[in-house]
């Protein structure tokens, strides 16, 4: 699940918890102790920004050695740089590494621009600021790569986060989150608070800003405001949702809520903006432009192919509409909203020209591959991965970029019926074709 | 829309010199800068020079004095005429336009698809 559009930071402005907490509900109380409260470890321990990718860091090897990975909630591999590439400042050193046990066995990932591939082999991997604990992971030594490493996003390689299923060469390549649970006590969760800038960032600011935290093992209620609304996983490969209903200022975009699932829904730390198919992208554009009708906008600007820019300060959030999108509930018939402000879609972009203009690009975009909620969805919320119970968690993020009028929100419950009929079932392959 | 046509890149030895220019199609509310930038692998983006609709330019250090920008308003053309190119020179060069702000103030940056240089000592 690489950049691109796939694959800005948090810097004092802002981001105070808005409103008052609410009272939870018992319902959502763990079932293993130990899984809520504090983690101050771990607040605070991503960095980079939407367009690059956000980063933990991460060692391997003995002694250890230090490297900056991508989090990426869309892929199951543990890939990192392990040969000289223009891009990296470091790379694994397999040689130096006395626990490294080489597999003896290659790996090759295409995506749809770009590639990696390298040697799989397995090695000791600790979080620094993580859980204190060290595992024996699976790790692809990327040797070869194509369109893969960003340049400048101070990143050396990926930690896929989702399921065995999408694991390259195949499931039985156990994917990191697996081998941590196995190996240790740490509870099968993990949350995210991914904190967009609301402006960008030049390279020594985002090495110097807090891009987010990734809680490994449980949720920390100074990460977000109000309630966790949770969706569940539908299927364990990518994380899988059910989109089942979309708004657009309020305004109900009525189609066929299939289409918001065709051929799936997934939430992707890993992906930039928000992807939608084809034909919802076309209705929600249509409706964001009748909704901010008192301009009219390039056709390029809607396409991500062209920039627009205020005098700096002078924004017009308010002509911009927010969006809702309605998530299947925990409960039969009941369903709860998230809704993203044009602080999230708008992403800030350096102008080419000049420093004295605030400028943006439309983060949302047309995919061929099912609707895709990435860091510009995410940016907005607090999100936990409850892979134990199957679910995943929705409250607002408390780093979230947001005006005095509007903020982002999660709100339920809302009666819906039939949401089942909302998932897509994508035809199953017969493996055996693909073996000619 | 904002479209743009670049053309002038090429080969060239160390010393010599390209012309490279740029079309943009109209506007409604005109272009109020137009400019390059230059990307070369594994590099930083770096805006070479840029021209207001005033005609006031600007240049990096690293061209003062080799390349000139200018610009034709009637046909929307942007040029940038390069002398004593050298190997650092090397880049893909894009062309940009920025145009003036509409009657909500927003301004719209369209680029290029670029056009390649490259300089043998």
């Known amino acids: 699940t690489q950049h691109g559009i796939r694959l800005p930071l948090r810097s004092g402005l802002g981001g105070a918890p808005l409103g008052l907490r609410l009272p939870r509900e018992t319902d959502e109380e763990p079932e293993e102790p130990g899984r809520r409260g504090s983690f101050v470890e771990m607040v605070d321990n991503l960095r980079g920004k939407s367009g690059q990718g956000y980063y933990v860091e991460m060692t391997v090897g003995s002694p250890p050695q230090t490297l900056n990975i991508l989090v990426d909630t869309g892929s199951s591999n543990f890939a990192v740089g392990a040969a000289p590439h223009p891009f990296l400042h470091r790379y694994y050193q397999r040689q130096l590494s006395s626990t490294y046990r080489d597999l003896r066995k290659g790996v090759y990932v295409p995506y749809t621009q770009g590639k990696w591939e390298g040697e799989l082999g397995t090695d000791l991997v600790s979080i620094p600021h993580g859980p204190n604990v060290t595992v024996r992971a699976n790790i692809a030594a990327i040797t070869e790569s194509d369109k893969f490493f960003i340049n400048g996003s101070n990143w050396e390689g990926i930690l896929g986060l989702a399921y065995a299923e999408i694991a390259r060469p195949d499931d039985s390549l156990e994917p990191f989150f697996d081998s941590l649970v196995k190996q240790t006590h740490v509870p099968n969760l993990f949350s995210l608070q991914l904190c967009g800038a609301g402006f960008p960032l030049n390279q020594s600011e985002v090495l110097a800003s807090v891009g987010g935290s990734m809680i490994i093992g449980g949720i920390d209620h100074s990460l977000y405001t109000g309630s966790l609304w949770y969706t569940p996983i539908r299927r364990e490969w990518y994380y899988e949702v059910i989109i089942v209903r979309v708004e657009i200022n309020g305004q109900d975009l009525k189609m066929d809520c299939k289409e918001y699932n065709y051929d799936k829904s997934i939430v992707d730390s890993g992906t930039t903006n928000l992807r939608l198919p084809k034909k919802v992208f076309e209705a929600a554009v249509k409706s964001i432009k009748a909704a901010s009708s008192t301009e009219k906008f390039p056709d390029g600007f809607w396409l991500g192919e062209q920039l627009v820019c205020w005098q700096a300060g002078t924004t017009p959030w308010n002509i911009f509409p927010v969006i809702s999108l309605y998530l299947m509930g925990e409960v039969t018939n009941q369903s709860f909203r998230i809704t993203i402000l044009p602080q999230q879609y708008l992403r800030p972009v350096e102008d080419v020209a000049t420093s004295q203009d605030d400028c943006y690009k439309f983060a949302i975009s047309q995919s061929s591959t099912g609707t895709v909620m990435g860091a510009v969805i995410m940016e907005g919320f607090y999100v936990v991965f409850d892979r134990a119970r199957k679910r995943i968690g929705f409250a607002v993020s408390a780093c979230h970029v947001h005006d005095e009028f509007r903020t982002a929100a999660v709100e339920g419950p809302f009666v819906t019926l039939d949401m089942e009929d909302c998932g897509y079932n994508i035809p199953q392959t017969d493996e055996s074709t693909l073996m000619t | 829309d904002v479209q743009l046509q670049e053309s002038g890149g090429g080969s060239v030895q160390a010393g010599g010199s390209l012309r490279l220019s740029c079309a943009a199609s109209?506007?409604?509310?005109?272009?109020?800068?137009m400019g390059w930038y230059r990307q070369a692998p594994g590099k930083e983006r770096e805006l070479v020079s840029t021209?207001?609709?005033?005609?006031?330019?600007s240049y990096v250090d690293s061209v003062k004095g080799r390349f000139t920008i200018s610009q034709d308003n009637a046909k929307n053309t942007v040029y940038l005429q390069m002398n004593s190119l050298k190997p650092e020179d090397t880049a893909k060069y894009y062309c940009?336009?920025?145009?003036?702000?509409?009657?909500?103030?927003?301004?719209?940056?369209?680029w290029g698809q670029g056009t390649q240089v490259t300089v043998s000592s």
């Open positions: 021209i207001t609709s005033d005609g006031s330019t």
């Open positions: 109209e506007y409604t509310y005109g272009y109020c800068s």
């Open positions: 940009y336009t920025k145009t003036c702000a509409n009657k909500l103030g927003a301004k719209f940056i369209s």
